[in-house]
Interface confidence: medium
């Protein structure tokens, strides 16, 4: 039977407001609202917490019965939808011990694990996996790319009691490995032997100058020489123009700097590798994965452009249950969500096309009207001129 420590799907209307607590650490934290957004797969099931104010910090958390993950697997899972086409903002969660004062949660509140997507401009599009180990926040050494489109995505972190981990996006593995290898929790197992140094006669040169090679006697030639084809102009006046000097040209016989040919170095020993020894500072920690106490899940974020929706939170000890839960929530509505978005996009495109067409027709009608007015004006002018001509007496007409 899986242990479900925390599950939140926001299926009871405003009920969430009694389970989630706003931090009062700052007076101007952004407000979360319950919404399924502008497009969705299922209007009710896809309701989640949506950030609603631009350029704000958000600090909201929910508590649950405290538990320890010692000796068992920990799975943290939730969905994130950046329907605002996010440019800078967090989409991650923090797991805190139950000692957290939820009304005072803020960016420096000590957490156990931080996990989830983070986007900021073109430079940051990553999934954070940060563990607090002995009071220090330790970041993963790998770059895990997050999704940056407008659709809902499922993020899963699995931490196992054998000190291995797995990160999944949309129920597909994107990263896995060992905690010890992929984070710098512990000092390195091996260090360079401080007592070892490269022997003085160690030769790392693969090639050397051939000692038998010597520069040919006719090698050294000037780089530039007077142009042998140049002639002094006939009108050159040495008194007036000074002594005539032919222009210089590149010497075709110039060979540049002579270098002896290279041969294999008979004394070459290869690159010296500093020998390593076991690091006396290193001692394995089989319980890196373990925390005594989890009691609060928090959203502690900054967003430039609001609109992100968080939903389908799950903390459990059962990987299979989490996968199943993901498929029953995100999995069931993702296709319909895309369908609705595509339909909206198509409607928008048609609307814009229609507006363009209408505008062009109006412009053409205006142009036509202008042309007709112009034609009428020209006809009026001609009629006017004819009338004036008819009014002029005969003899005066000849004089005109």
């Amino acid at each position: 039977e899986p242990a479900v420590y925390f599950k939140e799907q926001f299926l009871d209307g405003d009920g969430w407001t009694s389970r989630w607590i706003e931090s009062k650490h700052k007076s101007d934290f952004g407000k979360f609202v319950l919404s399924s957004g502008k497009f969705y797969g299922d209007e009710e099931k896809d309701k989640g917490l949506q950030t609603s104010q631009d350029a704000r910090f958000y600090a909201l958390s929910a508590s649950f019965e405290p538990f320890s993950n010692k000796g068992q697997t920990l799975v943290v899972q939730f969905t994130v939808k950046h329907e605002q086409n996010i440019d800078c903002g967090g989409g991650y969660v923090k797991l805190f011990p139950n000692s957290l004062d939820q009304t005072d949660m803020h960016g420096d509140s000590e957490y156990n694990i931080m996990f989830g997507p983070d986007i900021c401009g073109p430079g940051t599009k990553k999934v954070h996996v940060i563990f607090n180990y002995k009071g220090k926040n330790v970041l993963i050494n790998k770059d895990i790319r997050c999704k940056d489109d407008e659709f809902t995505h499922l993020y899963t972190l699995i931490v196992r009691p054998d000190n291995t981990y797995e990160v999944k996006i949309d129920n597909s593995q994107v990263e896995s490995g060992s905690l010890e290898d992929d984070w710098d929790f512990l000092p390195p197992k091996k260090i360079k032997d401080p007592d070892a140094s490269k022997p003085e006669d160690w030769d790392e040169r693969a090639k050397i100058d051939d000692p038998t090679d010597s520069k040919p006697e006719d090698w050294d030639k000037p780089e530039h020489i007077p142009d042998p084809d140049a002639k002094k102009p006939e009108d050159w006046d040495e008194e007036m123009d000074g002594e005539w000097e032919p222009p210089v040209i590149q010497n075709p016989e110039y060979k540049g700097e002579w270098k002896p040919r290279q041969i294999d170095n008979p004394d070459y020993k290869g690159t010296w590798i500093h020998p390593e020894i076991d690091n006396p500072e290193y001692s394995p920690d089989p319980s890196i994965y373990a925390y005594d106490n989890f009691g609060v899940l928090g959203l502690d974020l900054w967003q430039v452009k609001s609109g992100t929706i968080f939903d389908n939170f799950l903390i459990t000890n059962d990987e299979a249950y989490a996968e199943e839960f993901g498929n029953e929530t995100w999995g069931v509505t993702k296709a319909a969500e895309k369908q609705m978005k595509d339909k909206q996009d198509e409607e928008q495109r048609l609307k814009e096309e229609e507006e363009d067409k209408k505008r062009k027709e109006e412009e053409e009608a205006e142009d036509k009207e202008d042309d007709e007015d112009k034609d009428e004006d020209e006809e009026d002018e001609e009629d006017k001129e004819e009338d004036e001509e008819e009014d002029v007496p005969g003899q005066a007409k000849d004089e005109l």
Epitope: G90, G107, D118, C120, G121, P122, G123, L139
Partner: nanobody, 116 residues
Framework: QVQLQESGGGLVQPGGSLRLSCTAS?????FGWYRQAPGKQREFVAN???????RYSDSVKGRFTISRDNAKNTVYLQMNILKPEDTAVYYC?????????????WGQGTQVTVSS
């Protein structure tokens, strides 16, 4: 600690232009301009990242241009074809990010009034 200083606000006729400046001290991940009209929520106008990518709100697209002088650590907002609805206090924002931590800093605001 990042200090921000805005300037360039004022009274301008509809259709006119203004250029706002914001000078910062410190290392910035993103600069943004926001505005707040009387009785309304503060709203996003434009922002620019260190990498150079830029974003505008739909209401100012094509009229406003954000730019940055890295040597002076200054960000500008060139506002053209101003409309009465652009009247607001304009705030400069600087975002400093470090390993999942965010700190944002705000200027004191500069008033822009568009009126004939």
């Amino acid at each position: 600690q990042v200090q921000l200083q805005e300037s360039g606000g004022g009274l301008v006729q509809p259709g006119g232009s203004l250029r706002l400046s914001c000078t910062a001290s410190g290392s910035i991940a993103a600069f943004g301009w926001y505005r707040q009209a009387p009785g309304k929520q503060r709203e996003f106008v434009a922002n620019m990242y260190v990498g150079g990518s830029i974003r505008y709100s739909d209401s100012v697209k094509g009229r406003f241009t954000i730019s940055r002088d890295n040597a002076k650590n200054t960000v500008y907002l060139q506002m053209n074809i101003l409309k009465p609805e652009d009247t607001a206090v304009y705030y400069c924002n600087a975002l400093v990010r470090f390993e999942g931590r965010n700190d944002d800093y705000w200027g004191q605001g500069t008033q822009v009034t568009v009126s004939s």
